[in-house]
């Protein structure tokens, strides 16, 4: 038994036929010693007398609000809730399994940007006697603060004969660092109480994995002279992180009829304009995704093709925006070849995802994973890799990136990747290895050797251990190169001499 909140207790029960249940001792919160009687819920039947009451809790009939009285006066209450465990598994009767992205997904969370603000939601078919309480933190062993509001009913839907209720909650990390590479996941815990049943649900994620931008805004069409083609332009959504030269998006533009089966035109671009073929009765749609990390695509923003004549023309901003004026060269060190670094780091992002594309479908955050991922270098908040830090002195950040590149380059050349099951040299991992080396050489200033971090002694003996470690390393590498690519893209746009 444990206390959920003041005067509310959860009794954990193994739930099987003829289970002995749990013996619970309730103590009346009073200085009085005698003349105390106990009742349950609205019943006037006296269950016992004395300052303590011992009960055997086996089923829901034994749970409820226990009240101690003296001479018709209520002294205190103790609400007992039951938490069922069947075959070693805690019950999940209150919430509906959303089955996306995998089975046993009860909580789903999304973030519109990297500000540390996110929304979680869940579904239930229960309409009454239902309460939720949400807690969250960054990491679990040494948790950092995340503040969550109250869960509210956000939608009601009819599903066949049933009504389905959607609840949602907004949370905000207290000291968010949008530009940093996350090393500890956000933990979300939801306590659900239905009548006398208690259940808890958890979700663990990195903000980068739950990013889903809002749709692009201000779609405009401009027909091109003497052509079937139309130039479509748009802008970054207002809710996306800034500056856009650092937090860049990529876009998919599609021309589609009302039916998905109809023919279409489709093009991908990093710019905020594209040229497509518009058809009568079709619509032009644009959606967005983080340019350097393969999280979710936004919903589509659409405009009908037929409106192309009357809509205001004007092309998009052409780039990833937010560039502003060219800034001064880097103090205290030579400036890198920003554009070359940008191109190579973007290639690294692509290679990191092609080396391990299924990463999103595998839950590798198992017990002890915080330790594993902390063995690799992370670009942290104080490393100067945020836009302001780069402007002040990019050398700190570049040194950190260089250390990380060398570290991962050594890891990819180590027994973890060279041992069984073997990888061929021109596999994506082989190309990734070579590109990491190439970028680290671009960064290393002449006659200047930065310190490099020691590789931890990770020597898995079994092929399956090696495979698991590869997944985890590539997962971390995807996050690391995404931050590096943002740094170089921003540098190329704003710091190039």
């Amino acid at each position: 038994i444990w206390e959920l909140k003041k005067d509310v207790y959860v009794v954990e029960l193994d739930w099987y036929p003829d289970a002995p249940g749990e013996m619970v001792v309730l103590t009346c919160d009073t200085p009085e010693e005698d003349g105390i009687t106990w009742t349950l819920d609205q019943s006037s039947e006296v269950l016992g007398s004395g300052k303590t009451l011992t009960i055997q809790v086996k089923e829901f009939g034994d749970a409820g609000q226990y009240t101690c009285h003296k001479g018709g006066e209520v002294l205190s209450h103790s609400l007992l809730l039951l938490h069922k465990k069947e075959d070693g598994i805690w019950s999940t009767d209150i919430l509906k399994d959303q089955k996306e992205p995998k089975n046993k997904t009860f909580l789903r969370c999304e973030a519109k940007n990297y500000s540390g603000r996110f929304t979680c939601w869940w579904l239930t078919t229960i309409s009454t006697d239902l309460t939720f309480s949400v807690k969250s933190s960054r990491g679990s062993s040494d948790p950092q603060g995340v503040t969550c509001g109250a869960a509210t009913l956000s939608a009601e839907r009819v599903r066949g004969d049933n009504k389905e209720y959607e609840y949602s909650v907004e949370c905000q990390e207290d000291s968010a660092c949008p530009a940093a590479e996350e090393s500890l996941p956000i933990e979300v815990m939801v306590d659900a109480v239905h009548k006398l049943k208690y259940e808890n649900y958890t979700s663990s994620f990195f903000i980068r994995d739950i990013i889903k931008p809002d749709p692009p805004k201000n779609l405009q069409l401009k027909p091109l002279k003497n052509s079937r083609q139309v130039e479509v332009s748009w802008e970054y959504p207002d809710t996306w992180s800034t500056p856009h030269s650092y937090f860049s998006l990529t876009f998919c533009v599609a021309v589609q009829g009302k039916s998905k089966r109809e023919k279409k035109d489709r093009v991908f671009t990093d710019k905020t304009s594209a040229t497509v073929i518009c058809r009568k009765n079709a619509s032009i749609s644009v959606r967005a995704q983080d340019r350097y990390y393969s999280s979710s695509w936004s919903e589509w923003a659409s405009v009908p093709c037929s409106g192309s004549g009357s809509s205001r023309g004007g092309s998009g901003s052409g780039g990833s925006g937010g560039g502003g004026s060219k800034l001064r060269a880097v103090p205290g060190g030579s400036s890198p070849a920003w554009t070359q670094c940008q191109q190579l780091s973007q290639k690294l992002c692509t290679l990191a995802w092609s080396a391990h594309p299924l990463v999103g479908h595998m839950d590798l955050r198992e017990e002890g994973d915080e330790e594993t991922t902390n063995d690799v270098p992370h670009i942290q908040c104080g490393d100067g890799c945020d836009p302001q830090g780069l402007r002040d002195n990019s050398q700190f950040c570049l040194q950190r990136i260089h250390q990380g590149l060398i570290f991962y380059e050594k890891l990819l050349g180590s027994d973890i990747f060279t041992g069984e099951p073997s990888l061929l040299p021109d596999s994506p991992v082989g190309q990734l290895h070579a590109s990491l080396l190439g970028l680290s050489q671009l960064l290393q200033p002449e006659g200047h050797h930065w310190e490099t971090q020691q590789i931890p002694s990770l020597s898995p003996s079994q092929p399956w251990q090696r495979l698991l470690l590869r997944f985890k390393i590539l997962r971390s590498l995807q996050a690391f190169v995404a931050v590096a690519a943002r740094v170089f893209a921003h540098g190329a746009a704003t710091l190039s001499p």
């Epitope: 079937r228 083609q229 990529t250 021309v255 089966r261 109809e262 023919k263 279409k264 035109d265 489709r266 093009v267 991908f268 671009t269 990093d270 040229t275 073929i277 058809r279 009568k280 092609s354 594309p357």
Partner: antibody, heavy 118, light 107 residues
């Protein structure tokens, strides 16, 4: 299944015109874009243009603009590509292809060899 | 127009070995890049679309990667039926253009 069957080989004199046909089957003709791509002997592939059979819209590669005409006959599910003012370097295999997506080529015809020789 | 350059022009590989074919665009084309296989006397066949998307019916040994200006087609373990010419094609803008092709031949 989706199939494209092209007309037979042609031999033409320089300055003449050629009209290659491409009969579609296995799908609703107006549901796919139709492209024409050619390949000179021992050479690579060269895109010529596309047509939307639903409305007759076309887009031609600048190199062929003014010399090529793409048409369709929806009643027979047939596409045509006419190339005028033929030169010896127009000697090639001409392929028609169809796709629901405009910008790449999913289903190909077997090809029609057009020889331009005096 | 966007110029597509493939390398090498010819690649000699033994059956069972891995083949890596490169394609470079003269300007950034995001992932608007498609790969085709052509055997002698046959029409080309679509293998990969949008840089890395696989086609149903195409063996899993064919995979694509890349974005921007550099792209790769990888055949993980060459089978006898894979010896052919491979073309890349950009769809970023009209006119649509192809690379010159890479001939994969038996070593």
């Amino acid at each position: 299944q989706v199939q494209l069957v092209q007309s037979g080989a042609e031999v033409k004199k320089p300055g003449a015109s050629v009209k290659v046909s491409c009969k579609a089957s296995g799908y609703t003709f107006t549901d796919y874009y139709l492209h024409w791509v050619r390949q000179a002997p021992g050479q690579g592939l060269e895109w010529m243009g596309w047509i939307d059979p639903e409305n007759g819209d076309t887009e031609y590669a600048p190199k062929f603009q003014g010399r090529v005409t793409m048409t369709t006959d929806t009643s027979t599910s047939t596409a045509y590509m006419e190339l005028r003012s033929l030169r010896s370097d127009d000697t090639a295999v001409y392929y028609c292809n169809a796709n629901k997506e405009l910008r790449y080529f999913d289903v190909w015809g077997q090809g029609t060899m057009v020889t331009v020789s005096s | 127009e966007i110029v597509m350059t493939q390398s090498p022009a010819t690649l000699s590989v033994s059956p069972g070995e891995r083949a890596t074919l490169s394609c470079r665009a003269s300007q950034s084309i995001s992932i608007n890049l498609h790969w085709y296989q052509q055997k002698p006397g046959q029409a080309p066949r679509l293998l990969i679309y949008f840089a890395s998307q696989s086609i149903s019916g195409i063996p899993a040994r064919f995979s694509g990667s890349g974005s921007g200006t550099e792209f790769t087609l990888t055949i993980s373990s060459l089978q006898s039926e894979d010896f052919a010419v491979y073309y890349c094609q950009q769809s970023n803008s009209f006119p649509l253009t192809f690379g010159g092709g890479t001939k994969v031949e038996i070593k």
